[in-house]
């Protein structure tokens, strides 16, 4: 069932031993049940491949989003599915290929001219008590009147960090994502002590540079643990 | 210069634990899965457990799932792999391994030890009987 699924954590395929040769098999291991897809055909394993159970978008690969496989179906069973090209469907940017944003329920690419105004952007409502679906999807709501500066530079709308420019990342701002900084030596950073946490965040914060780390600030180990703050420091 | 040091490896006995862990310094792992793989002399290195750059999500070989405990600390940058009911055939050098998040994922993908791009030197595990 699609539940089993969510519930397996066993490694599926091994991949032979260093050196070995390919197909042979390697320890025993937990096989994934099929997963149903739209028609009702049984998912097989093709190449290998087995589909990934996700709880958000981050779970899953760059290259991915996460959601129901099937349209109309259990809304709590999501996996992660290969993102949407250009042109495609779709509901929010998660489901556009890198380099690529929703716009009007259909995947177009972020490396136009420019300057693009209006760009409409489809968030999920984090807050309230309508959870309502639409094919499995938590309902959108879609914020207008955004404004797409040249891609990647600080304040653009991205999807990915990829997206931005380098020493900068895409982060959560208010209920779009833009490019921020990196963060420095010696400024404060967030770290996330509950699972999905960040999801609650709407000015999220970058990531620490290339060699810091986000680590309680020495002269605060003494406070409670909910005032501890947290800075980029050098290994 | 990125380095993982894995260290708490040692002689136990049949039955007994092990708490090992990996300390990661040089950059930010938060976007990398963080796996732990095995070799024991004369074989193949080999998959042991993984846990993924989001929610904690884990993976075990079936050999090991109920023995062994992976888990995280991102503020410390450490890894941990707490071994319990030891087995003679766990005895192996045990080494911390990091893959960055790929473009699609599968379960493969954290058993897969070219996806690692970066190792630690290794740490002795022996169990005697």
């Known amino acids: 069932t699609l539940n089993s699924v969510l519930n397996s954590n066993a490694i599926k395929n091994l991949p032979p031993p260093l050196g070995g040769a390919a197909g042979h098999p390697g320890s025993a291991v937990s096989a994934a049940p099929g997963i149903l897809y739209p028609g009702g055909n049984k998912y097989q394993t093709i190449d290998n491949y087995q589909p990934y159970p996700c709880a958000e978008d981050e779970e899953c690969g760059t290259d991915e989003y996460c959601a129901s496989p099937t349209r109309g179906g259990d809304a709590g069973v999501q996996i992660c599915l290969a993102c949407r090209k250009r042109r495609k469907r779709c509901m929010r940017h998660a489901m556009c290929c890198p380099g690529n944003y929703c716009k009007n329920g259909i995947c177009v690419s972020s490396d136009q001219n420019h300057f693009r105004g209006e760009i409409e952007e489809t968030i999920t409502e984090s807050f309230g008590n309508d959870h309502s679906t639409l094919d499995g999807y938590s309902r959108r709501t879609t914020l207008s009147s955004k404004m797409y500066h040249t891609k990647g530079q600080e304040g653009s709308v991205c999807l990915r960090s990829s997206d931005c420019a380098s020493g900068l990342c895409c982060a959560r701002h208010f209920w779009s994502k833009i490019c921020k900084p990196v963060l420095k030596e010696g400024q404060v950073c967030t770290k996330h002590r509950r699972k999905g946490s960040h999801g609650l965040e709407i000015f999220q914060r970058c990531y620490c540079g290339e060699g810091l780390s986000c680590r309680i600030q020495k002269d605060h180990h003494q406070a409670s643990n909910s005032s501890r703050l947290h800075t980029c420091q050098r290994h | 210069e990125v380095q993982l040091v894995e260290s708490g490896g040692g002689l136990v006995q049949s039955g007994g634990s092990l708490r090992l862990s990996c300390t990661a310094s040089?950059?930010?792992?938060?976007?990398?899965?963080m796996g732990w793989f095995r070799q024991a002399p004369g074989k193949e290195r080999e998959f042991v457990a993984a846990i993924s750059w989001a929610l904690s999500r884990t993976h075990y070989v079936d050999s090991v799932k109920g023995r062994f405990t992976i888990s995280r600390d991102n503020a410390k940058d450490t890894v941990q792999l707490q071994m319990s009911s030891l087995k003679p055939e766990d005895t192996a050098v045990y080494y911390c391994?990091?893959?960055?998040?790929?473009?699609?994922?599968?379960?493969?993908?954290?058993?897969?030890?070219?996806?690692?791009?970066?190792w630690g030197q290794g740490t002795q595990v022996t169990v005697s009987s």
């Open positions: 391994a990091a893959a960055p998040r790929p473009k699609r994922v599968s379960f493969s993908y954290f058993s897969t030890s070219s996806n690692y791009e970066y």
């Open positions: 040089g950059r930010t792992f938060d976007n990398y899965a």
